[in-house]
Amino acid sequence: AITEAREEAKPYPLFPGPFPGSLQTDHTPLLSLPHASGYQPALMFSPTQPGRPHTGNVAIPQVTSVESKPLPPLAFKHTVGHIILSEHKGVKFNCSISVPNIYQDTTISWWKDGKELLGAHHAITQFYPDDEVTAIIASFSITSVQRSDNGSYICKMKINNEEIVSDPIYIEVQGLPHFTKQPESMNVTRNTAFNLTCQAVGPPEPVNIFWVQNSSRVNEQPEKSPSVLTVPGLTEMAVFSCEAHNDKGLTVSKGVQINIKAIPSPPTEVSIRNSTAHSILISWVPGFDGYSPFRNCSIQVKEADPLSNGSVMIFNTSALPHLYQIKQLQALANYSIGVSCMNEIGWSAVSPWILASTTEGAPSVAPLNVTVFLNESSDNVDIRWMKPPTKQQDGELVGYRISHVWQSAGISKELLEEVGQNGSRARISVQVHNATCTVRIAAVTRGGVGPFSDPVKIFIPAHGWVDYAPSSTPAPGNADPVLII
């Protein structure tokens, strides 16, 4: 250890013999107390009660006696002011003071950087009594110093409520550089400059920094810490570290991987979660993100029918939650579905295409050209229609549902009839005479009942009237047609 010995002052006459250096062998301590809590009481008894000492770092004792002669001021002896040593080495230093035996009780405590040292510190106070004074040596030892032991240590002695403070002893623990900031992993754009930072401290200072990229030194001439490395751009992944050097040696930072952002890999495992007549719910597992967060995804849908025009529908969605409901599809149709996702660099390739089918749905249009006429001879209403276009049946027709509502003199009655899929005509019995019959027809598939046609009305007269012309689905713009003769 390197020590800086400070000049020794003698504030109080010492007892004979060398002190505090190598103590004389015949000066065996009267009392040796290990620090239990870092707060060291030093007990001394004297029949004489001292007067009030002078405040400050030096106490001037007052003695009440016949002569009433004041004693010289009390102060700690000067000692080594600065101790420099390597990490993990042991160190021992001390404070010493000679106190007149007239004082009843004294207490010595150790302080570091303004805070009292309590707890697991190895401090011992030894007492060497003589005729007029007792020499007190307070020793402080650290078996394996760490950086955290750096600082300014002082002794304080309380004597009759007055405080005497020693000169500071500066402990400087030197060791290998210690990183306070290390480079961090990053994802960067290809051929784009970026910065890495490295900072290390001693003591001893200065700390010099070398940068290493893929085990090649970037700067053959070191930079003083802290150092910012501007990397001019990368075309492929690289590993960086920094070396911190000081007079004690070298410390190497952790190696960090710098990745190059790229387009994502295509999604995988596109699967069908649910199908309805007009929608398909799909999910997918995202591919590798290319070191850049996904922004959004695109679902591409094309009809699998070889006779279709091959047009592709594109649906854009957010990247999460890897789920999308494709809507506005035709019923009972086959589709090829692919998914592509993008990050800041660009779009991935499309996932492997999967085949999916929509289910049967209720027809989307009503039967056309509905015609209604009264066949009075048989007391029936005849109904005729044309089936909806095949494309809009949304499934295989299983039949039709006919709604006929009879209204007369405030009475209204609705009846429903089901007819088979083969027919395009039906006959219903007259339910009420002198009434209006309103007819609507819907196509039916296994997927459900389609929309009803516009209502067609026919008036059913009382018995004995002639046969009438038919009533039919109105031309656009004509609402509520009714035939009355």
Epitope: N214, S216, E220, Q221, L229, P232, G233, T235
Partner: antibody, heavy 118, light 106 residues
Framework: QVQLVQSGSELKKPGASVKVSCKAS????????MSWVRQAPGQGLEWMGW????????TYTDDFKGRFVFSLDTSVSTAYLQISSLKAEDTAVYYC???????????WGQGTLVTVSS | DIQLTQSPSFLSASVGDRVTITCRAS?????MHWYQQEPGKAPKLLIY???NLAQGVPSRFSGSGSGTEFTLTISSLQPEDFATYYC?????????FGQGTKLEIK
């Protein structure tokens, strides 16, 4: 503007010594290393090595160990190349070049022609 | 040591032409730098770290590549571009230069 100014041409006899200087200006001399590059007549560039301007420690490539010495006078921001026991094949233009991160030689002296002839 | 081979060694071209010079390394390197040397003058840094234009260099110069193959491209030759071009590798000591490519007026 960063400048590296080299000493003038030298004509030397075989066996003699020569010392080429390279004075740097407009930047902090001890922040960047200084490299030396040789170019024989009609030939390409050969990196001879460099000197750490902060510590004064030189590094030589294998072909330039022995008779070649790099040195510094930081008080005048000057680097030196000394060649001893000159041979005819040492005839070349010698360049100093500022040496930065990633082995980039970003500024060059104008070159010093050393001719070794009996 | 890493050997750098430039091709071609000589190149004749006309003003306005687009020219490409290739530099191949005997093993993978971290970066390639390019220098221009006019007759009787010192080399001048043109491109550093494979693709970065040095200060004051016109944008008609560009660099690319990685691993063992690197290129210098001049998009439209100007009269002042007729010179010798050298590549130099970083990644393995000692740093080495290519043998040079002399670009001449056709």
């Amino acid at each position: 503007q960063v400048q590296l100014v080299q000493s003038g041409s030298e004509l030397k006899k075989p066996g003699a010594s020569v010392k080429v200087s390279c004075k740097a200006s407009s930047y902090t001399f001890t922040t960047y290393g200084m490299s030396w590059v040789r170019q024989a007549p009609g030939q390409g560039l050969e990196w001879m090595g460099w000197i750490n301007t902060a510590s004064g420690v030189p590094t030589y490539t294998d072909d330039f160990k022995g008779r070649f010495v790099f040195s510094l006078d930081t008080s005048v921001s000057t680097a030196y190349l000394q060649i001893s026991s000159l041979k005819a094949e040492d005839t070349a233009v010698y360049y100093c070049a500022r040496y930065t991160n990633y082995g980039v030689f970003d500024y060059w002296g104008q070159g010093t022609l050393v001719t070794v002839s009996s | 040591d890493i050997q750098l081979t430039q091709s071609p060694s000589f190149l004749s071209a006309s003003v306005g032409d687009r020219v490409t010079i290739t530099c191949r390394a005997s093993s993978s390197v971290g970066y390639m730098h390019w220098y221009q040397q006019e007759p009787g003058k010192a080399p001048k840094l043109l491109i550093y770290a494979t693709s970065n234009l040095a200060q004051g260099v016109p944008s008609r110069f560009s660099g690319s590549g990685s691993g063992t193959e690197f290129t210098l491209t001049i998009s439209s030759l100007q009269p002042e571009d007729f010179a010798t071009y050298y590549c130099q590798q970083w990644g393995s000591l000692p740093f080495t230069f290519g043998q040079g490519t002399k670009l001449e007026i056709k």
